[in-house]
């Protein structure tokens, strides 16, 4: 167990300067998993600081992180994925602060990709499709996706749609005619695994058709 004071008033008396956060990515490189940690305060002097993970590992007691500029990183097959690991910031042999973390609760999926939008003239709708590497994975297979779209001129007026599949239909009548739209998508674990939103996919831009005055319908692109 970590050797911190048990008194409830003291337990958060670890050096706040060294508070950090981490996320895991499972099967990020074949069967290899990764763990990435960084200090919350970007001004921390990281010169002599190291990260170490102990517990809930296969065949080894502890692993050291590699330092990549301001982040700390491990890529390994040795995560047991059950039980809590102790992640510590260290100077030499001295632990400055530690966190007990279950790596299955800090999973950050990879960003979706190949986002595209196809207009269907007959159906008067737009079919949004995208891909995710998680369809091929064995652990984090079930995701919730957040599709966000906005009219390009509306800086912060994003409309969000949550879905579990990789296909979404947007009705033409719900969108402004003859307008440029930006759309993007991100993912979060669903079913057993917990964690954080992925990075956003690259944005895709599409234009809605003009309204055809005679029929009251939009022109195809």
């Amino acid at each position: 167990e970590s050797g911190y004071a048990q008194n409830g008033d003291l337990e958060d008396a670890e050096l706040d300067d060294y508070s950090f956060s981490c996320y895991s990515q499972l099967e990020v490189n074949g069967s290899q998993h990764s763990l990435t940690c960084a200090f919350e305060d970007p001004d921390v002097n990281i010169t002599n600081l190291e990260f170490e993970i102990c517990g809930a590992l296969v065949e080894v007691k502890c692993l050291n992180f590699r330092k990549l500029q301001e982040i700390y990183f491990i890529e390994t097959k040795k995560f047991l994925l059950i039980g809590k690991s102790n992640i510590c910031v260290k100077v030499g042999e001295k632990s400055l602060t530690c966190k007990k973390i279950d790596l299955t609760t800090i999973v950050k999926p990879e960003a979706p990709f190949d986002l595209s939008v196809v207009y269907r003239e007959g159906a008067n709708d737009f079919v949004v499709t995208f891909n995710t590497s998680h369809l091929q994975k064995k652990y984090v297979k079930v995701l919730m996706h957040d599709v966000a779209y906005r009219q390009e001129k509306d800086e912060n007026k994003w409309t969000h749609v949550n879905l579990s599949s990789t296909k979404l239909t947007l009705l033409q009548r719900k969108l402004q005619p003859a307008a440029m739209y930006e759309i993007k998508v991100r993912s979060i674990p669903d079913h057993y695994f917990k964690g954080f939103w992925s990075e956003w996919s690259p944005s895709y831009y599409f234009r809605t058709p003009e309204i055809n005055n005679s029929s009251g319908e939009m022109d195809p692109i």
Partner: antibody, heavy 118, light 111 residues
Framework: QVQLVQSGAEVKKPGASVKVSCKAS????????LHWVRQAPGQGLEWMGG????????AYNQKFKGRVTMTSDRSTSTVYMELSSLRSEDTAVYYC???????????WGQGTTVTVSS | DIVLTQSPASLAVSPGQRATITCRTS??????????MHWYQQKPGQPPKLLIY???NLESGVPARFSGSGSETDFTLTINPVEAEDTANYYC?????????FGGGTKVEIK
């Protein structure tokens, strides 16, 4: 050493409430979730729910939703389980248990016997 | 809810012999190589004690004569060789889905 110490036995009338405490020691209280599991006389084990002392977040077995409340007090490293609208079927030994991982229980309290009888 | 069915309900074994308890689940409790099945021992008047977590990982301090195996819906707890002090009830438990459920228990007696 790591220990969970529970409050003493209770005898309650049907319709009443009971509040059982579980004091943790020997580890950092906010590092592990604490759960409640009960065992009726001569019966098996039944998970009731759990609490994360760091956030106060709870997860309850749907069977007990609306009747059970779990709380924690970081200043005393204690969690509480309150069960209301007691009936005779709630007569059981109630255990608090630490979750070593999702969600298995590596440390158990000694148990608190709750008897519901008119 | 996921139903866990243990067999046999009771078992009498001679010291030095092997005891095998099985636990079958109503749906898979595995995600690839992550098997969310755990085993406990409970002696009369005592709380349960964790023996095995994640189907096959021996809890610290538990004798190596206890072992676990299995995946998906079929899991086994083996005690080999059985000792007199192993007289107890044994329970399996799944943790893939809330509510986290236990098997009905297997009573092991030493002849």
């Amino acid at each position: 050493q790591v220990q969970l110490v529970q409050s003493g036995a209770e005898v309650k009338k049907p319709g009443a409430s009971v509040k059982v405490s579980c004091k943790a020691s020997g580890y950092r209280f906010t590092d592990y979730e604490l759960h409640w599991v009960r065992q009726a006389p001569g019966q098996g084990l039944e998970w009731m729910g759990g609490i994360d002392p760091k956030t106060g977040g709870t997860a309850y077995n749907q069977k007990f939703k609306g009747r059970v409340t779990m709380t924690s007090d970081r200043s005393t490293s204690t969690v509480y389980m309150e069960l209301s609208s007691l009936r005779s079927e709630d007569t059981a030994v109630y255990y608090c248990a630490r979750s070593g991982g999702r969600w298995y229980f590596d440390v158990w309290g000694q148990g608190t016997t709750v008897t519901v009888s008119s | 809810d996921i139903v866990l069915t243990q067999s046999p309900a009771s078992l009498a074994v001679s010291p030095g012999q092997r005891a095998t308890i099985t636990c079958r689940t109503s749906e898979s409790v595995s995600i690839h190589l992550l098997h969310l099945m755990h085993w406990y021992q409970q002696k009369p008047g005592q709380p349960p004690k964790l023996l095995i977590y994640g189907a096959s990982n021996l809890e610290s301090g538990v004798p190596a004569r206890f072992s676990g195996s299995g995946s998906e819906t079929d899991f086994t707890l083996t005690i080999n060789p059985v000792e007199a002090e192993d007289t107890a009830n044994y329970y399996c438990q799944q943790s893939i889905k809330d509510p986290y459920t236990f098997g009905g228990g297997t009573k092991v007696e030493i002849k």
